[in-house]
């Protein structure tokens, strides 16, 4: 059929949650192209109706939820306008059992369920939540051992859950859990994560390199929308949290209340030496009491500034 | 059930370079830490490097000049390799991964080791 | 470096002796953790953690300490016991193991 067969991934799903593939292969994916997925080589393709419990939304394959008999291989085919490209997509489903301790080991998951922190050090797991964006997902909630995770040591932020000074108690299994919201209807995700701990520094201490910002100013309107992306180098084995701050303060912490001042959701792109991290903080409606605070893009030892101010008054 | 297994030749030259692969079974070696260790005869261990999930290398500064550990996660193999040998590096070799009760460090899983001598 | 020294180097016992390996380090470490080796085999890890014992490890095996002092015990040591045990620290850069004690029957 003249399809390039790109690769196979692998992914142990869990019975009776939502679940979501992306069909991305940069740079195929960047172009022109249009996707359609199949499964197990049919020529029939997923339904695009959203009513549907399985279908395609844009470049996405969406199960909602996902079901056992949806166990199988599943094809997204890429096509350019003169090029076609497949990929193969395993998927492998389970009943899920986090809370059985009669059950000792989770199955082979994927390497995004298997996370570790640091000894000593401040560090963090992540919620994975690959979903498109018809998807709301709800605050994240965290467990562990199936307890819901309280205490100064924990802090949520975004899809990150903050351990401070980790220490030994800290392995073992956790949960993040998100209520998702798809056509007015809602599902419950539950990722089970496996958490090890390691002493080993691991990034060989190595200190986080921020390109931006650069202790600089913003001239920015009262009243606008901003955005800034704070840009950060750091080694693939890091450890580092990366956050904005503000009066030593999580900005989401110190505009808890009105939600004015957020920050968003880090994003990462690999290369082969390092990893260039982007975690953007976002100005709803700039205020008065904004202009000459700095606002501070952390990333382990490494710390940088923006400064809002007004514009210069035009006398033109 | 995890299994490491060494591979190598078993005997090498001065000045040559040893190279040895370990064949993980069992674990992805896209989690976790994959670590190497020599057994002098007669002497004690010593560590000799590991390469993480995310292909981080550590090497032991004793070694770092002549040492390079990597890996092919399409096979679930790690490699070792050791430049310039000398009769000093005759030795037992493992390879060794934790994990053991969710302790990377605790180093649970081993190879059986491979002799490998350096001799003319 | 942190530099691992057990003590003793070699020790002859007897069957049901109370024994205690020593292990001092040149610098604090957080944890410390022993492999037992026999002959021809490869080491097992023993104790992890400073004071747990890995799978199948006999409970008259103990371990504890903090700081740069760390102990194996064995409270009456049995035949299969006799083999070298090594300590290991993974705080601090290069992982060093101690030189090994072997244990030996008197």
């Known amino acids: 059929d003249g399809c390039n067969d790109i690769f196979m991934k692998n992914e142990m799903l869990s019975a009776s949650q939502p679940f979501a593939f992306n069909c991305t292969f940069p740079p195929i994916t960047s172009g022109e192209v249009s996707v359609t997925w199949y499964k197990n080589s049919s020529k029939i393709p997923v339904s695009k109706i959203i009513q549907s419990r399985i279908h395609q939304d844009e470049t996405w394959i969406l199960f909602l939820p996902m079901e056992w008999g949806d166990s199988g291989v599943y094809q997204c085919v890429i096509k350019g306008r003169d090029s076609c490209h497949r990929i193969h997509v395993n998927l492998t489903v389970f009943e899920k059992q986090w809370c059985d301790t009669s059950v000792k080991g989770l199955p082979n998951l994927s390497d995004e369920y298997k996370q570790i922190l640091h000894l000593g050090k401040d560090d963090s797991l992540t919620c994975h939540l690959h979903f498109p964006k018809s998807c709301i997902l709800g605050p994240i909630k965290w467990y562990k051992d199936c307890n819901e995770i309280t205490g100064e040591r924990f802090t949520v932020l975004e899809t990150r859950l903050l351990v401070s000074n980790v220490s030994a108690e800290d392995r073992g299994n956790y949960a993040c859990q998100v209520i998702l919201t798809h056509s007015g209807k809602q599902y419950e995700v539950l990722n089970g994560i496996t958490v090890s701990i390691t002493e080993r520094a691991g990034y060989g201490g190595s200190v986080p390199k921020i390109i931006y910002p650069k202790n600089n100013s913003i001239e920015v309107q009262l009243g606008t929308t901003l955005i800034v992306d704070c840009n950060i180098t750091d080694t693939k084995d890091n450890t580092n949290l990366r956050c904005w701050r503000v009066n030593n303060t999580l900005v989401d912490d110190y505009y808890n209340e009105s939600k004015r001042i957020r920050e968003g959701v880090e994003t990462h792109a690999s290369f082969r030496e390092y990893n260039l991290y982007t975690v953007n903080i976002t100005f709803l409606e700039v205020k008065m009491e904004d202009y000459g605070l700095p606002f501070m893009c952390h990333a382990g030892v490494s710390a940088a500034y923006i400064m809002l101010q007004l514009p210069a008054p035009d006398f033109r | 059930q995890v299994q490491l297994q060494e591979s190598g030749p078993g005997l090498v030259k001065p000045s040559q370079t040893l190279s040895l692969t370990c064949t993980v079974s069992?674990?992805?070696?896209?989690?976790g830490y994959w670590n190497w260790i020599r057994n002098h005869p007669g002497k004690g261990l010593e560590y000799i490097g590991y390469i993480s999930y995310s292909g981080y290398t550590y090497y032991n500064p004793s070694l770092k000049s002549r040492v390079t550990i990597s890996r092919d996660t399409s096979k679930n193999q790690f490699s070792l390799k050791l430049s310039s040998v000398t009769a000093a590096d005759t030795a037992v070799y493992y390879c060794?991964?934790?994990?053991?009760?969710?302790?990377?460090?605790?180093?649970?899983?081993w190879g059986q080791g491979t002799l490998v001598t350096v001799s003319s | 470096d942190i530099q691992m020294t057990q003590s003793p180097s070699s020790l002859s016992a007897s069957v049901g002796d109370r024994v205690t390996i020593t292990c001092r380090a040149s610098?604090?470490?957080?944890?410390m953790y022993w492999y037992q080796q026999k002959p021809g085999k490869a080491p097992k890890l023993w104790i992890y953690?400073?004071?747990n014992l890995a799978s199948g490890v006999p409970s008259r095996f103990s371990g504890s300490g903090s700081g740069t002092s760390y102990t194996l015990t064995i409270s009456s040591l049995q035949p299969e016991d006799f083999a070298t045990y090594y300590c290991?620290?993974?705080?601090?850069?290069?992982?060093?193991f101690g030189q090994g004690t072997k244990l030996e029957i008197k």
């Open positions: 069992g674990a992805s070696i896209t989690s």
């Open positions: 610098s604090n470490v957080r944890y």
């Open positions: 953690l400073t004071s």
């Open positions: 060794a991964t934790g994990g053991y009760d969710y302790v990377e460090d605790a180093l649970y899983y």
């Open positions: 290991q620290q993974f705080t601090t850069s290069p992982y060093t």
